[in-house]
Structures are given as structure tokens and as C-alpha cells.
Interface confidence: low
């Protein structure tokens, strides 16, 4: 396996001001070893592992305001440890493809 | 960046448990790419239950296979082609 912490840029949206701020943070990316069982035993469902967080913390950033909107605080998750493990569907949207970490609904991006 | 060389590609390999001399059972195994990151606001808005993290993943699965019966009467899949595609058993 080569699932590891990677530097990424995430976009944090300030909806009412129609802009995003970009933040450098760490998240998980890489390759995980999986296999498709030849004998499908319903009593023992197989587990497919995905590169996901083992430990995470939350960080808070001040998002600047605009015109009639004050600054606000935005809290986002940061991975501190990664592994090839099960996707925790309670906290995670387990999908094939999402919008990507730096998706911004608006044209304007602030550093 | 994560290095693909560190992990063997998703390919057919012999399954030692079900294979017999002259009658190999092949199985898809190997590595596929996945990543996780904070869920963008636009995605959160479409969720009934909001999830803070998005995990994008594919798993090494059989693209095609033949069903065969092996010793002991077990019905198994003899995989004939593999690919990195939808994970079905990766959620907890």
C-alpha cells in the first residue's frame, strides 16, 4: 500500500459573498490493495480498503466578510494520519468521484 | 505524490486455496487509487445526512468471470479480467 498524507488545496466557500478562500492542508491519497473474492460467503462479507483518514483533527479559519456580511469562522477536518481501511459511512461520503477538494461554486477565489 | 510503483497493479493472480493442478482458479487482486478530502459545501447541500469527509475510491474487482464448481462442491468465480471499479464492500 502507498496511502499517505498529501498536501492539497481546499476551497472554503463564503456563500453570501459569492467567493471562496483557498487553504493548504493535508489529506490522504494513494493506492490500497484490494481483491475480489472468488468464493462469495454471505456470512463473511469481504472488506475492500480505501485510502482514508485514520486520525483527524478540526481546524478553524476566519473567513473574511463582504459589504453587509461580517467575517465568519469555518471549521474543517484535517487528516493527521492515513491508512488503507474501511470507509466510515457515518462521517464520510463514500463515492467513486466527488467534486474534488478545491471545488468552488463561484468564480472568485481568494488566497 | 503517492507512487504507483509501491503497489502492484490490479491483475489476475492464482488463488492458491481453490486451485488444483491443471485447473487454476484466478482471482483479481492489486492496488487501485483512492483519496479523501473535506466535503465541498455544494456536495454537502445535496446530502440528507451531511458528511464532513469525501472518500473517492475504486477497488480491484472482476470485470468478467466464469462460475465453476471445485472440490468440496464450492461454487466459485474463476476471474477472467480485472479492473479498478466500484467498491461494494468498503463501507463500515
Amino acid at each position: 500500500n502507498s496511502c499517505e498524507l498529501t498536501n492539497i488545496t481546499i476551497a472554503i466557500e463564503k456563500e453570501e459573498c459569492r467567493f471562496c478562500i483557498s487553504i493548504n492542508t493535508t489529506w490522504c491519497a494513494g493506492y490500497c490493495y484490494t481483491r475480489d473474492l472468488v468464493y462469495k460467503d454471505p456470512a463473511r462479507p469481504k472488506i475492500q480498503k480505501t485510502c482514508t483518514f485514520k486520525e483527524l483533527v478540526y481546524e478553524t479559519v476566519r473567513v473574511p466578510g463582504c459589504a453587509h456580511h461580517a467575517d465568519s469562522l469555518y471549521t474543517y477536518p484535517v487528516a493527521t494520519q492515513c491508512h488503507c481501511g474501511k470507509c466510515d459511512s457515518d462521517s464520510t461520503d463514500c463515492t467513486v468521484r466527488g467534486l474534488g477538494p478545491s471545488y468552488c461554486s463561484f468564480g472568485e477565489m481568494k488566497e | 505524490a503517492p507512487d504507483v510503483q509501491d503497489c502492484p497493479e490490479c491483475t489476475l493472480q492464482e488463488n492458491p486455496f481453490f486451485s488444483q493442478p491443471g485447473a487454476p482458479i484466478l482471482q483479481c487482486m492489486g492496488c487501485c487509487f483512492s483519496r479523501a478530502y473535506p466535503t465541498p459545501l455544494r456536495s454537502k447541500k445535496t446530502m440528507l445526512v451531511q458528511k464532513n469527509v469525501t472518500s473517492e475510491s475504486t477497488c480491484c474487482v472482476a470485470k468478467s468471470y466464469n462460475r465453476v464448481t471445485v472440490m468440496g462442491g464450492f461454487k466459485v468465480e474463476n476471474h477472467t479480467a480485472c479492473h479498478c471499479s466500484t467498491c461494494y464492500y468498503h463501507k463500515s
Epitope: N7, G100 | C10, C32, C82, H83, C84
Partner: antibody
């Protein structure tokens, strides 16, 4: 050796549609995302979208939604792009290109087809 | 993505640097491509500085944050081409406008 062989040049009328193809060889077609890129003189390169033949998943640049439709035939290892309601703005060279990482749509494009010239003219 | 120089003239044997600037940080998710006059496109550098297989070692890439560059250390006749940068940090993937390299 990875090869992407695109179909030949097309001369088409405005308002009609065209479907161009990209035949892949030298690798497992279903394991890699295949992207499409548009090149117009003076406009550089533009990413249209991509498809993962392993599951039929597609992703489009908002700009090309409704204009391009991406499909793939796994039995012949061929990807297709259909362009509809053609105008002179669609006159361009269209490239298919494969991602470098198996199972992943990230990483840009490691291998490119030779390009298909589409000319829209009355 | 911006490639400020649209064309560049250099002599054989020269060290040539082509730059590319992003409007926001792209975490090194940047590739460089070469398009020959016949239209053929090849990947040269991926993830800012990794050399794609089969690419001569005279090509190198560097950069971080928003500013990136491609360097050809010893210009050869076959390097005459247009060079494009591309980011894959944020959808949609975007390319620079290209820098056409010519021989003096």
C-alpha cells in the same frame, strides 16, 4: 506500448452532430480514465471531460455540458465523443488522452491520440 | 493558468526556462506537455518535477504554490515545439496558453 488511435478528419454541416472515436491498445482499457481535449488555433487546449470505461462514469467541463457526450465500448476498447448542434466555434482538433494512474482520474494525461480535425462549414 | 511568454527564441545548446503561473495555489498538481509542429502531444513532466518515462533528462520542472517552470538545460533541434502547462488540482482541468519555442 500504449496507443490511442483516433478516427479521421470530419467535414460537417452546421446544426448537425458528429461522433469521433478513439481506439485504445497496449493497456487494460477499463482501468484508466480517458479524457478529451479541444484545440482551436489561438485558443490553446481546453479539457472537455473524461470517462472511466470500467464503470461508465463521466465528468464534464461545465462549458461542454450539452455539447459533448462521452461513451465507451469496452468490447472494442474504443471511446467515443459525440458533438451536437455544431457551429463554427466547434471547428477544432479534438484529442483523446489517457490518465497516468490506473483507477484514478487525477494526474493529467500521460498518453495522447494524434487528434481528429472537425471542420464545421456550410 | 497563465503562460506569460507566448513565444521564445533560443540557440541550440542554450538553457531555456518557460514559466507558468496559477491564479491560486495548486499544491504542485501541475504537468508539462510538448506539442510538436505535426500536432503530436507528449507528457514531459508530471507533479511539477517528475520526469515521465522516456523523456530526456535535459527536461526538468520546478515550482510551488502558484509559480512553476519548465527548464530545458541544453536545447536540441528536436525540442522545437509548443509547451503547455496544465493543472489538475481543481476541476475543470485547465491548460496554460502555450509557449512556442523557436531556434534563433
Amino acid at each position: 506500448e500504449v496507443q490511442l488511435q483516433e478516427s479521421g478528419a470530419e467535414l460537417v454541416r452546421p446544426g448537425t452532430s458528429v461522433k469521433i472515436s478513439c481506439k485504445a491498445s497496449g493497456y487494460t482499457f477499463t482501468n484508466y480514465w480517458l479524457g478529451w481535449v479541444k484545440q482551436r488555433p489561438g485558443h490553446g487546449l481546453e479539457w472537455i471531460g473524461d470517462i472511466y470505461p470500467g464503470g461508465g462514469y463521466t465528468n464534464y467541463n461545465e462549458k461542454f455540458k450539452g455539447k459533448a457526450t462521452l461513451t465507451a465500448d469496452t468490447s472494442s476498447s474504443t471511446a467515443y465523443m459525440q458533438l451536437s448542434s455544431l457551429t463554427s466555434e466547434d471547428s477544432a482538433v479534438y484529442f483523446c488522452a489517457r490518465t497516468p494512474l490506473y483507477g484514478s482520474s487525477y494526474g493529467g494525461f500521460a498518453y495522447w491520440g494524434q487528434g481528429t480535425l472537425v471542420t464545421v462549414s456550410a | 493558468k497563465t503562460q506569460t511568454t507566448s513565444s521564445l527564441s533560443a540557440s541550440l545548446g542554450d538553457r531555456v526556462t518557460i514559466s507558468c503561473s496559477a491564479s491560486q495555489g495548486i499544491s504542485n498538481y501541475l504537468n508539462w506537455y510538448q506539442q510538436k509542429p505535426d500536432g503530436t502531444v507528449k507528457l514531459l513532466i508530471y507533479y511539477t518535477s517528475s520526469l515521465h518515462s522516456g523523456v530526456p533528462s535535459r527536461f526538468s520542472g520546478s515550482g510551488s504554490g502558484t509559480d512553476y517552470s519548465l527548464t530545458i538545460s541544453n536545447l536540441e533541434p528536436e525540442d522545437i515545439a509548443t509547451y503547455y502547462c496544465q493543472q489538475y488540482s481543481k476541476l475543470p482541468w485547465t491548460f496554460g496558453g502555450g509557449t512556442k519555442l523557436e531556434i534563433k
